[in-house]
């Protein structure tokens, strides 16, 4: 099923480039191109619990102290993701010598719950967002970011870790979700598909977008990522959908133009600091929010997901560069690096705006309106 033509004020209408006429249904890939529910998960690029790996390598985080014993997250192993026989090319993985279960990939055994029991948890990510069923919460105020406009120096590490491209962020990027919810940004990474196949992790009414950006944050209540894993609100991810638009996105080009340098799995390069907020939609007031998990092992729960309503526009060439430049280990292309959507299991997705109005292909059907659980400011 395809989305109807989206209006400017309807959920996910319009990209951050400010166009008034977002893509119509003829421009959107069909849902049949998306992986099935049992398809391989993608990664949220975070470290694992104890000796379990995370989805992406995170920098060492020591905001409260500089003790020598802090866990170096890049030293954590990674684990295997379950495979999908229908996605043989979707097998990017990262090997670490000397460990049993020391790597994970998109495709292949063992099943994730065997690697990390949390992957079989009830409150996993990503999920399908149904705007009609989202609970409008006026208490969800506009997000606030601080320090995201970075100077060219110092340069930042851009790395192909075998399952995504990740930009490590320096100290000082703060994000506020509301009362008692202050965070520091750690890294960002992307999820994508393949030629003609969308690759976002979250979906909207079953529609999968071409790609998705995740900016991963650690709560200021925790000094280190491993302390925050599995703790409610310990980690927070800002997520935005990437769509095809008519113009080149100059902010993304600063990263995409460097992908050839890190085509090989495990390679990295240094890029000048840039305006990280320019990689996100411009409308910080309209978003969906729910509590979920990391999207790869260890699949730790308690992660606050904030998914922007507005999309970000990239040119067709840029989306092609993203999905067709990087390689995983061996001769496998790094593509389709996303996890299938997970059941809500009673969770309510909250919206900072009245998302259910004229936004769903099933708008004519009776809808059970969910109530807002968020506390006021």
């Amino acid at each position: 099923q395809r989305l109807p033509r989206m209006q400017e004020d309807s959920p996910l209408g319009g990209g951050s480039s400010g166009e008034d006429d977002p893509l119509g249904e003829e421009d959107l890939p069909s849902e049949e191109d998306s992986p099935r529910e049992e398809d391989p998960p993608g990664e949220e690029d975070l470290p694992g619990e104890e000796d379990l790996p995370g989805e992406e390598d995170l920098p060492e985080v020591k905001p409260k102290s500089e003790e020598e014993g802090s866990l170096k997250l890049e030293d954590l192993p990674t684990v295997e993701a379950p495979g999908d026989p229908q996605e043989p090319q979707n097998n990017a993985h990262r090997d670490k010598e000397g460990d049993d279960q020391s790597h994970w990939r998109y495709g292949g055994d063992p099943p994730w719950p065997r690697v990390s029991p949390a992957c079989a948890g009830r409150f996993q990510s990503p999920v399908d967002i149904r705007p009609q069923l989202a609970a409008f919460c006026p208490a969800l105020r506009p997000l606030e970011l601080l320090g995201f406009q970075l100077p060219p120096l110092p340069e930042l590490r851009l790395r192909n870790n075998g399952h995504s491209v990740q930009l490590t962020l320096p100290p000082g990027l703060e994000m506020a979700l509301g009362p008692g919810r202050e965070y520091r940004a750690l890294q960002l990474h992307l999820h994508w598909g393949a030629a003609g196949r969308p690759g976002s992790e979250h979906t909207v009414e079953g529609h999968r977008f071409p790609a998705e950006i995740h900016v991963v944050h650690l709560s200021t209540a925790f000094a280190r990522v491993d302390e925050a894993l599995g703790r409610p609100g310990g980690l927070a991810v800002l997520a935005a959908f990437l769509e095809e638009g008519p113009e080149e996105n100059s902010a993304y080009e600063q990263l995409l133009s460097r992908l050839e340098e890190i085509a090989e799995e495990g390679s990295e390069t240094q890029v000048p600091g840039l305006d990280i907020s320019a990689l996100l939609p411009s409308d910080f007031s309209r978003y969906f929010q729910y509590e979920g998990s990391l999207t790869t092992p260890p699949c730790a729960q308690g992660v606050i997901w904030t998914v922007f309503n507005q999309t970000v526009m990239l040119s067709a060439k840029q989306l092609h560069t993203l999905s067709d430049t990087l390689w995983g280990p061996g001769d496998s292309r790094l593509q389709l690096n996303f996890r299938a959507t997970q059941p809500l299991n009673g969770r309510v997705i909250e919206a900072s705006f009245p998302a259910g109005v004229d936004s769903s292909p099933r708008a004519a059907e009776p809808v059970q309106l969910n109530s807002c659980l968020a506390a006021g400011d």
Partner: antibody, heavy 119, light 107 residues
């Protein structure tokens, strides 16, 4: 009602020190980012220093770095600004400001305390 | 540092007039802009946050708009009690910076 009351201002010679205090009431102080903002006579507003809710993150205006220290005592609901090596250009009305709960924008200001640096 | 250029520096208008104050940031600050009102002899008072969100208790004649680098504070129908200095502020990047202020006088 939110109330912020500054104190500790006064007349001091160049090179001298002062400690400003801001007593907060009417809200859960430990949940809020706080700042000191100053306004020189007849001039605009200038952020001097800021501190997050648990004191783990601080910021200083370049011209006061190394001379001023912002701190807070959440048990006493008090914000401080220790000022040393004072210069004539530090002469201003110093306001204590509270930020919106969990956010960076400021929503309440005290009435200010006057600092005059003069020989 | 991000410069916030506010204009005009002063204006005189009649009660009932529509008044517009603009603020231009030297670089993208997304929507991290606040507006404050400072009446003579008083501390600043909050008006707008996140560029366009009015604080509770602020009269609806005050509105804010803009994103990126260009921001506007509008008083739709000026009242006598609106005589004050108005300041914009960005809190997107340290150091948080204020505009130079706009003095609004009543004719």
């Amino acid at each position: 009602d939110v109330k912020l009351v500054e104190s500790g201002g006064g007349l001091v010679k160049p090179g001298g020190s002062l400690r400003l205090s801001c007593a907060a009431s009417g809200f859960t102080f430990s949940n809020y980012y706080m700042s000191w903002v100053r306004q020189a006579p007849g001039k605009g507003l200038e952020l001097v220093a800021a501190i997050n809710s648990d004191g783990g993150i601080t910021y200083y205006l370049d011209t006061v770095k190394g001379r001023f220290t912002i701190s807070r005592d959440n048990a006493k609901n008090t914000l401080y600004l220790q000022m040393s090596s004072l210069k004539s250009e530090d002469t201003a009305l110093y306001y204590c400001a509270r930020h919106r709960s969990g956010y960076f924008s400021m929503d309440y200001w005290g009435q200010g305390t006057s600092v005059t640096v003069s020989s | 540092d991000i410069q916030m250029t506010q204009s005009p520096s002063s204006l005189s208008a009649s009660v009932g007039d529509r008044v517009t104050i603009t603020c231009k940031a030297s670089q993208n600050v997304v929507s991290a802009v606040a507006w404050y009102q400072q009446k003579p002899g008083q501390a600043p008072r909050r008006l707008i946050y996140s560029a366009s969100n009015r604080y509770t208790g602020v009269p609806d004649r005050f509105s804010g708009s803009g994103s990126g680098t260009d921001f506007t504070l509008t008083i739709s129908s000026l009242q006598a009690e609106d005589l004050a200095d108005y300041y914009c502020q960005q809190y997107s990047n340290y150091p948080w910076t204020f505009g130079g202020g706009t003095k609004v006088e009543i004719k």
